[in-house]
């Protein structure tokens, strides 16, 4: 009643190992680390064999079949290189994941590289089987910015993909009798958000009080140069519009509101994200230069009363942009107390602009954002959002331009945006 | 096209309650607030109250903050006006206006007397 | 609260003749950063709800005859019917909606 003698497997042992198997011996048979049973086109981690009365084994000896980890996950805004020749994902092989560079960077710098395991899922020392994330690059344009030399009233032609995070907003508002259509701007802020000023977004109302827009009336484009050609942009509905709680409409005091896209936007060298700062109740320090740019009035000699009575004719075609200096806040505040009317210069604001005039944001920048470029993480940060300006046509000699002041509202942006500041650490200005 | 249709006349007596209705049609009943005032016979308007379907948002006169309860039920589009505590100066004519006062209820006529 | 009085009470005027009714808040109702006066003016006639003619002080309600118009900034406005017709004959109301809302007391406005 001996059975014939057994040979292990190619990567595998059978235990125990005798010299002589007998009727009623059993046989486990496994394979090496990497290597599976294979019986019957099953994989298994072992398989049994006993010694029949007849002196036969009751079934074949199983191969063993090397692990193989198939072809790995798809990474959104990523790329996938096989280290192994052959393209090969078997037991030991090593892919690297990237991102889509420049636009898009790893989260917490991660290697990328994945391993297949024995377990046949392809692991990475520090996210396991978990994929890694690619995260928007945020306040690195293609395109350099210009050196900020002294001297959108007074300001320029901005290249395309100068100011990628501009985004023009359209607000069509069929509720209201005849049909409202107004505009401002937003800076982008991931894929899928766009930061602006709540002013922008309120319903404008025939009294104060303050409701928002429907989301279906709101219409983004990115990526945007010259109005007239709106082909080479990418246009967006809102799925969400949210202005800050406590916006108040007789002092623009916490102007600030953002747009959740309907879908992500697809980043490249004209479209791209601008850093949030940290959180700072200072803001930006006095005298700073900040760039701004818009499809605002450009003709310093238009006054408010002709741009409101002239609708869209005297808007840029071209995105424009101004430098202007951070103004100290006492001084602002100085220069709208001497002014007849509700001027209130809050914490939750900051002034910029010229002494002399001739260089300001005006009506139809509003939203923009106001950007400085840090020195310390190599990035263009958004301080500011275009808010409001004194009665006097924009430009005007000591009339600043008054910003939301960014900084005051990081936390909430965030919470808004549903993601943890860690989470973010790349978008923050470091 | 728009309409604002209010409940019919009510005579209540003094101290009781009475709950006014004004059904919204032909536009999005949450993009707008539902505004709410009152008329006393041979006298000028008094603006009561707003109230915002979207969100239940209310803001009151305060001079009716405590007669008034402004609530809406947005899934038959129907705004309410409840008045407590009624006596004969409430006797009015009530209306209800929306798209900022574009349209109007045909207006509600509450009596109080005993 | 902000209060609206209303200039005259009631003013009798010719057919095709200009009506002119006064309004003053007591304080100003022009909003500095969006540049807009937060006054409107209504028509009402008997046994109906009131019209919404004008808002933010001179903008005409789509459908209102252009003999209807506002002016006026800050605290003083004022309304216009340049040529009187019989179907005007109704009662005016200001309101503001700068804070809340108030109405005037109301003009009344006959056929001499």
């Known amino acids: 009643n001996e059975c014939p003698e057994l040979q292990p497997p190619v990567h595998g042992k059978i235990e125990p190992s005798q010299a002589k198997y007998f009727f009623k011996d059993q046989v486990l048979v496994s394979c090496d680390t990497g290597y599976k049973v294979l019986k019957d086109n099953v994989e298994m981690d072992t398989f049994q064999i006993e010694c029949l009365k007849d002196g036969t084994w009751s079934n074949k000896i199983p191969t063993c079949k090397i692990v193989d980890c198939r072809a790995p996950g798809e990474l959104e805004h990523g790329l996938i290189t096989f280290s192994t020749r052959n393209n090969l994902t078997t037991y030991k092989s090593e892919i690297k994941y990237s991102c889509q560079e420049p636009y898009y960077k790893m989260l917490n710098n991660n290697t990328g590289i994945y391993t297949c395991s024995a377990q046949g899922v392809w692991m990475n020392k520090v996210l396991g089987r978990s994929l890694p994330t690619c995260l928007p690059e945020c306040g690195q344009p293609s395109r350099s910015l210009p050196s900020l030399v002294k001297r959108i009233i007074g300001g320029r032609n901005a290249e395309p993909g100068l100011f990628p995070w501009q985004a023009l907003i359209v607000v069509e508002d069929t509720s209201r009798v005849p049909n409202d259509k107004w505009f401002g701007s937003g800076a982008l802020l991931s894929a899928s958000w766009i930061l602006t000023a709540a002013h922008v977004l309120r319903s404008q109302r025939r009294d104060t009080t303050v409701i928002p827009v429907s989301k279906e009336h709101v219409t983004v484009y990115l990526g945007l140069h010259d109005v007239r050609d709106k082909s080479g942009a990418v246009n967006s509905s809102a799925a969400r519009v949210v202005l800050h709680p406590d916006f108040n409409i007789q002092n623009y005091n916490h102007d600030i509101a953002l747009v959740q896209l309907q879908e992500p936007v697809p980043l490249g060298p004209h479209v791209m994200p601008v850093c949030l700062p940290r959180l700072e109740p200072e803001g930006p320090a006095p005298h700073m230069l900040g760039l701004v740019a818009g499809w605002g009035i450009s003709n310093p000699n238009v006054t408010v009363d002709e741009i409101i009575s002239s609708g869209t004719r005297t808007l840029s075609d071209v995105l424009q942009y101004v430098k202007l200096p951070v103004v100290p806040h006492a001084e602002c505040k100085t220069s709208y107390e001497s002014r007849s009317g509700n001027y209130s210069v809050t914490e939750n604001m900051f002034c910029a602009g010229y002494y002399e005039g001739g260089k300001d944001t005006c009506l139809g920048d509003s939203g923009g954002a106001f950007v400085i470029f840090d020195d310390l993480s190599q990035r263009w940060v958004v301080q500011g959002l275009v808010s409001w300006g004194g009665p006097e046509e924009c430009g005007s000699k000591q009339v600043y331009g008054v910003y939301t002041k960014v900084s005051n509202y990081v936390d909430w942006v965030w919470e808004q945006m549903g993601l943890p500041q860690s989470v973010v650490e790349p978008q923050v200005e470091r | 096209q728009v309409q604002l249709v209010q409940s019919g006349a009510e005579v209540k007596k003094p101290g009781a309650s009475v709950k006014v209705s004004c059904k919204a049609s032909g536009y999005t009943f949450t993009t707008d607030d539902i505004n709410w005032v009152r008329q006393a016979p041979g006298q000028g308007l008094e603006w009561i109250g707003w109230i915002y379907p979207r969100d239940d948002r209310t803001k009151y006169n305060d001079k009716f903050k405590d007669k008034a309860t402004l609530t809406v039920d947005t899934s038959s589009n129907t705004a309410y006006m409840e008045l407590s505590s009624l006596r004969s100066e409430d006797t009015a004519v009530y209306y209800c206006?929306?798209?900022?006062?574009?349209?109007w209820g045909q207006g509600t006529l509450v009596t109080v007397s005993s | 609260d902000i209060v609206m009085t209303q200039s005259p009470d009631s003013l009798a005027v010719s057919l095709g003749e200009r009506a002119t009714i006064n309004c003053k808040s007591s304080q100003s109702l022009l909003n500095s950063r969006t540049r807009k006066n937060y006054l409107a003016w209504y028509q009402q006639k008997p046994g109906q709800p009131p019209k919404l003619l004008i808002y933010?002080?001179?903008t005409r309600e789509s459908g209102v005859p252009d003999r209807f118009s506002g002016s006026g900034s800050g605290t003083d406005f004022t309304l216009t019917i340049s040529s009187l017709q019989a179907e005007d004959v109704a009662v005016y109301y200001c309101k503001q909606s700068y804070n809340l809302y108030t109405f005037g007391q109301g003009t009344k406005v006959e056929i001499k």
């Open positions: 933010w002080a001179s």
């Open positions: 206006s929306s798209l900022e006062d574009t349209y």
